[in-house]
């Protein structure tokens, strides 16, 4: 999916009002010095691409993020504010239902969510005007 035509300001507002708080809840008890951000993004569409990938694609050691509250709210925000996003996700959602697993918060998941916070932080940053 190409995130170029999303309403970035509306997504940002949704992130600040709810999604960010759910990510903090997920990370509660984790030291703020524990993880260094290694995943980065260069602009807002790229950030959303990376956010979608880390939030919804299972990775080795962390298969369960898609059912978390922050993930469901992320999906809703993208569906509302990115034209045509919902249609592209129907097949992916059906595939995910088939491989639903028990929720387990592993250290790998905590690290992944820390990376997500970094990507969202980059997404939210003020635009750098050319100097």
């Amino acid at each position: 999916y190409d995130f170029t035509n999303c309403d970035f300001e509306k997504i940002k507002a949704a992130y600040l009002s709810t999604i960010s708080k759910d990510l903090i809840t997920y990370m509660s008890g984790t030291k703020s010095t524990e993880f260094n951000n290694t995943v980065s993004c260069s602009n807002r569409p790229h950030c959303l691409t990376e956010i979608q990938s880390l939030t919804f694609n299972p990775t080795a050691g962390c298969a369960s993020l898609a059912k978390e509250m922050f993930a469901m709210k992320t999906k809703a925000a993208l569906a509302i504010w990115c034209p045509g996003y919902s249609e592209t996700q129907i097949n992916a959602t059906q595939a995910m239902k088939k491989r639903r697993k028990r929720k387990v918060t592993t250290n790998k998941c905590l690290e992944q969510v820390s990376q997500l916070q970094g990507l969202w932080r980059r997404f939210n940053r003020p635009l750098l005007k050319q100097q």
Epitope: S17, R121, L128, K129
Partner: antibody
């Protein structure tokens, strides 16, 4: 807990340079931008610029272009702001501040460094 | 550059009063606005981000509202510790300019 500790007060002559340090602790230093803000006596807040400690990328307010240099030392988790060709109107309190978790504000600030420029 | 104008520049009020400070941006900044409180000799403290989200530890008597070019910070019932100077800052694009400040004094 998150802390930003700045270097002590400075007295400089016009034309000289000053380098203010901001030592960060309690968080992953390279994950968050640092901004620098100054405040002249009895005046408001003036934004000077930002640095990404991970990449070293900087963005300076146009007013300070050519006179300010922001750097970061990852090994000591310290950010620096150097201002050159000082003039009397640079007399101010200089603050560093850390980007928030969400990237939508600056949530922790240093205690401030007072710079006096006088002949 | 985006200019931020605050009003009033100073305000006298009493403990228990409801006060509102406004901030106007010279162009649309959506909800990208922050409010800070500053006391003499101290660094600013974050109150509100994203125009309406209260920062951690900030009392619920503070609230932010607005979007686009018009914003406000309201203190529903002034407490003695609220007498300070308040600044808005836009967070839309660099440079991240501050408002002119509003000094809140005891009547």
């Amino acid at each position: 807990q998150v802390q930003l500790v700045q270097s002590g007060a400075e007295v400089k002559k016009p034309g000289a340079s000053v380098k203010v340090s901001c030592k960060a602790s309690g968080y992953a230093f390279t994950n968050y931008l640092i901004e620098w803000v100054r405040q002249a006596p009895g005046q408001g807040l003036e934004w000077m610029g930002i640095i990404n400690p991970e990449s070293g990328d900087t963005y300076y307010a146009q007013k300070f272009q050519g006179r300010v240099t922001m750097t970061a030392d990852k090994s000591t988790s310290t950010a620096y702001m150097e201002l050159s060709s000082l003039r009397s109107e640079d007399s101010a309190v200089y603050f560093c501040a850390k980007e928030s978790l969400t990237g939508s504000s600056y949530d922790y600030w240093g205690q401030g460094t007072t710079l006096t420029v006088s002949s | 550059d985006i200019q931020m104008t605050q009003s009033p520049s100073s305000l006298s009020a009493s403990v228990g009063d409801r006060v509102t400070i406004t901030c106007r941006a010279s162009e649309n900044i959506y909800s990208n606005l922050v409010w800070y409180q500053q006391k003499p000799g101290k660094a600013p403290q974050l109150l509100v981000y994203g125009a309406r989200n209260l920062a951690d530890g900030v009392p619920s008597r503070f609230s932010g509202s607005g979007s686009g070019t018009q914003f406000s910070l309201t203190i529903s019932s002034l407490q003695p510790e609220d007498f300070a100077t308040y600044y808005c800052q836009h967070f839309y694009e660099t440079p991240l300019t501050f408002g002119t400040g509003t000094k809140l004094e005891i009547k």
